[in-house]
Amino acid sequence: TQNKALPENVKYGIVLDAGSSHTSLYIYKWPAEKENDTGVVHQVEECRVKGPGISKFVQKVNEIGIYLTDCMERAREVIPRSQHQETPVYLGATAGMRLLRMESEELADRVLDVVERSLSNYPFDFQGARIITGQEEGAYGWITINYLLGKFSQKTRWFSIVPYETNNQETFGALDLGGASTQVTFVPQNQTIESPDNALQFRLYGKDYNVYTHSFLCYGKDQALWQKLAKDIQVASNEILRDPCFHPGYKKVVNVSDLYKTPCTKRFEMTLPFQQFEIQGIGNYQQCHQSILELFNTSYCPYSQCAFNGIFLPPLQGDFGAFSAFYFVMKFLNLTSEKVSQEKVTEMMKKFCAQPWEEIKTSYAGVKEKYLSEYCFSGTYILSLLLQGYHFTADSWEHIHFIGKIQGSDAGWTLGYMLNLTNMIPAEQPLSTPLSHSTYV
């Protein structure tokens, strides 16, 4: 009989991000003896699960096992066999499942139960599947980017995202855009966080952080589009919706039942004299922008200042990393460069939205039409959210850095989530030999 193989001097962790539109599996790796050092964990693999988000399996839970198979098998290939049983697996579900839970706690529990049973069938150290809160999503995204940028380290950072910035220990704010929610998280400058729900206190590597965070449910790009359609169809004279957020010549039939399926459109729901309507694109950035602004209620603020919908937002402070769909959309539109001013971004969006649909399809032949058709809306929405929603200005725009990866690791909440659950972010600054520690995020 063989003895149990000595583990490699590295460890692995798996986090599944069960988002509203899709699920991604991330594999992380780190040297076993440097668990408490900052910046040692890095991503070795991302596997995008084929299909929609897990909330869409509510009527077909028996298919969840098959849905997860390919990426879980990929994890088995990437991680050495001798490490499988020691590798923790976490699944965090975000706003798509939050919305399902709002509709039916029982259905959300059923989906999570099947997900748990499916994942526990693999030879990993499965640690559970849960719906993370919007506050957690914001906090873990903030931890991820600052960990990867070396902001928690007292030593000189080994990677600088901003060429002009060398060893600034000021943390970056985090801007995360998903399909169903969006998060804003940063350390305000000497500002009292007026609403306790938006305040987080961390002690990380011997330093205290007072962090502001808020997650806007229903303001992810997909749910924002549903909201906008539900709002606009209210005033349509017939079953034709002339929509400035889609390219001229674009046509798409929408079922009213699909439109009202999400809790995000409940406030706009009304009895319509038709069961379907047709979107007809007219491609006008300015009108699209105006329509989007109607989703943000800025008339009411019980605090010194608000973002929208009466949610407290302190004055913006420092640099921000904008990731997930902020990055994917702006990358597609070729607008991620540090050199592109806000005015230039707006100008390019005007041109892009005005391009005829047939022309767009030809120019981007390799892109799925469903995604391609929504870039005009998504780009306009990002501008509206950042400028009118979060109060960035033409001047402060240059403090937004659209980030996909930092040193090969995706920006997003998953790394921060794993660092926390594996107790790899000590409250105190570790000595050269890691201390035993008990206080974590």
């Epitope: 009989t1 149990k4 001798s82």
Partner: antibody, heavy 121, light 107 residues
Amino acid sequence: EVQLVESGGGLVKPGGSMRLSCAASGFTFSKYWMNWVRQSPGKGLEWVAEIRLKSNKYGTHYAESVKGRFTISRDDSKNTVYLQMNSLKTEDTAVYYCTTQLDLYWFFDVWGQGTTVTVSS
Amino acid sequence: EIVLTQSPATLSLSPGERATLSCRASQSISDYLHWYQQKPGQAPRLLIYYASQSISGIPARFSGSGSGTDFTLTISSLEPEDFAVYYCQNGHSLPLTFGGGTKLEIK
């Protein structure tokens, strides 16, 4: 010496219950997944159940044929794994082996000598 | 569930001959296939793990090969003590399953 010793087998009527025990020695019991495998008279081998570690919340898995009737459990302080068998059927008659894998997973490099369970009226 | 089909059900050979036992999986299981030997009245004994990995203490005449769905256990030159029943086992996914066995008997 690495050893697994099963006990608790015997004769039981259909519908009855029985609890098998397996005492482990010679290795760090709490670090290894434990399994039960059975063999009906003159037949092949059939995996019955698996139990994982405390860190895995003692996760269990079962063959479809025993799900809902059999329960695997472990007591790490006693280095013992159990198989509680309820609603026994004649087709559960078999030699029950306690097994584990001391290297990697999902194969069995350590076996007990087996304990015979006979379900008959 | 992964179904393993072993062939032949019985193999009659003489000592000194080469034995080739086959195991086919109903779907790809990479190299997660293990081989056991069982003699009457005894518990099975692991011979080969992960399709081709040898076990210390098992004679070198036992070797395994294959990947995906088709696997082979080869005994290069049969010794009298090798006559027994051989089982393959799916170690890829739950439920763990065994093949029906190949009985290797003296001709």
